[in-house]
């Protein structure tokens, strides 16, 4: 059947998800397309312990989430709801800056390298996580 | 032995439709995206479609967008590629490829003609 | 759409020479680059990916080297083998695009 019962290999298996860490950069939106190449997304953070999680795996280096406001409200890749969900942004973040001279403000989200969250320019070629969840149907204990 | 056998190539004429098939053995197929890539006579290299392992995300070149629908048979480790209203500029050899995590292309198939004649 | 320049579109060599061939990409792709080889009537062999990771089975006479827009496939001493066409490949960004190839032919 197409039920995900374990994690692809070089995927890392956490509380029912699995995670693919890259080691290179892409621009968010191509981030996100190789995360939907492999039938993930990016990485959507619903708690402190998934958060502390991914810090650990990603050490101090700025790393794409799937949180954006590229349409206006920040939106997680998954349909989770941001208003009520988990947080962890920087002091004064998000702040939309435009002083970097690229064009435009700051769209979409990243772990920076203490693992607080930061908007920045959605070109910028940062690496990124990409999350997929295991079937809830394999999570069912085997009949005996 | 890692393997990609193309099929369901010929002539066929402008506007027709031709459905391409590619036979995956040697690996665990549904576990890779896979993709489409084409090369008019005496040309260069044009890349056409890629669709995930699972089958559920697929991207297009424009050139081929809303003509051609790339998708998969997990169960029977083929890949397809239907190709609509056909035209001349169409005339190539399709290879089909395997995709790697570095999102290049490790292994290909040994390709199949679609000419686009009247 | 990001563009792959390719440098020259052929060259000519004898065996033991040492062939490079150059390929810009229009934008910045960091190392999301690829080598391909041709023969006539056959299928493309991939020989380099993210711009220097050589592939398993490739002799180590082929290397590949570069990143942001510039990059570069060196042959250090053609064989008889070589005598191809060569293609790059950006997989940075949909599309991904191939250089037009560069023929390596016989001196």
């Known amino acids: 059947g197409s039920e995900r019962t374990c994690c692809p290999v070089n995927w890392v298996e956490h509380e029912r998800s699995c995670y693919w860490f890259s080691r290179s950069g892409k621009a968010w939106a191509d981030a996100d397309n190789y995360c939907r190449l492999e039938d993930a997304h990016l990485v959507v953070v619903t708690s402190w312990e998934e958060q502390k999680f991914v810090q650990h795996h990603i050490g101090p280096v700025n790393t794409w989430m799937g949180l954006h406001d590229q349409n206006g409200p920040w939106k997680w890749v998954d349909g989770t709801d941001y208003e009520t969900g988990f947080k962890n942004w920087r002091p004064e973040q998000p702040d939309d800056w435009y002083g970097h001279g690229l064009g435009g403000g700051e769209d979409c989200a990243h772990f920076t390298d203490d693992g607080r969250w930061n908007d920045d320019v959605c070109q910028r070629p940062y690496r990124w996580v990409c999350e997929t969840e295991l079937d809830k149907a394999s999570q069912e204990p085997p009949l005996l | 032995e890692v393997q990609l056998l193309e099929s369901g190539g010929g002539l066929v004429q402008p506007g027709g439709s031709l459905r391409l098939s590619c036979a995956a053995s040697?690996?665990?197929?549904?576990?890779?995206?896979m993709s489409w890539v084409r090369q008019a006579p005496g040309k260069g290299l044009e890349w056409v479609s890629v669709?995930?392992?699972?089958?559920?995300?697929?991207f297009y070149a424009d050139s081929v967008k809303g003509r051609f629908t790339i998708s998969r048979d997990n169960s029977k480790n083929t890949l397809y590629l239907q190709m609509n209203s056909l035209r001349a500029e169409d005339t190539a050899v399709y290879y089909c490829?395997?995709?790697?995590?570095?999102?290049?292309?490790?292994?290909w198939g040994q390709g199949t003609m679609v000419t686009v004649s009247s | 759409d990001i563009q792959m320049t390719q440098s020259p579109s052929s060259v000519y060599a004898s065996v033991g020479d040492r062939v490079t061939i150059t390929c810009r990409a229009s934008?910045?792709?960091?190392?999301?680059l690829a080598w391909y080889q041709q023969k006539p009537g056959k299928a493309p062999k991939l020989l380099i990916y993210?711009?220097?990771s050589l592939q398993s089975g490739v002799p180590s006479r082929f290397s590949g080297s570069g990143s942001g827009t510039d990059f570069i496939l060196t042959i250090t001493s053609v064989q008889p083998d070589d005598f191809a066409t060569y293609y790059c490949?950006?997989?940075?960004?949909?599309?991904?695009?191939f250089g037009h190839g560069t023929k390596v032919d016989i001196k």
């Open positions: 934008q910045d792709i960091t190392s999301w």
């Open positions: 040697g690996f665990t197929f549904s576990s890779y995206a």
């Open positions: 490829a395997k995709r790697t995590g570095d999102d290049v292309f490790d292994i």
């Open positions: 669709i995930s392992g699972r089958g559920g995300t697929t």
């Open positions: 993210a711009a220097s």
């Open positions: 490949q950006q997989v940075n960004s949909f599309p991904f695009t």
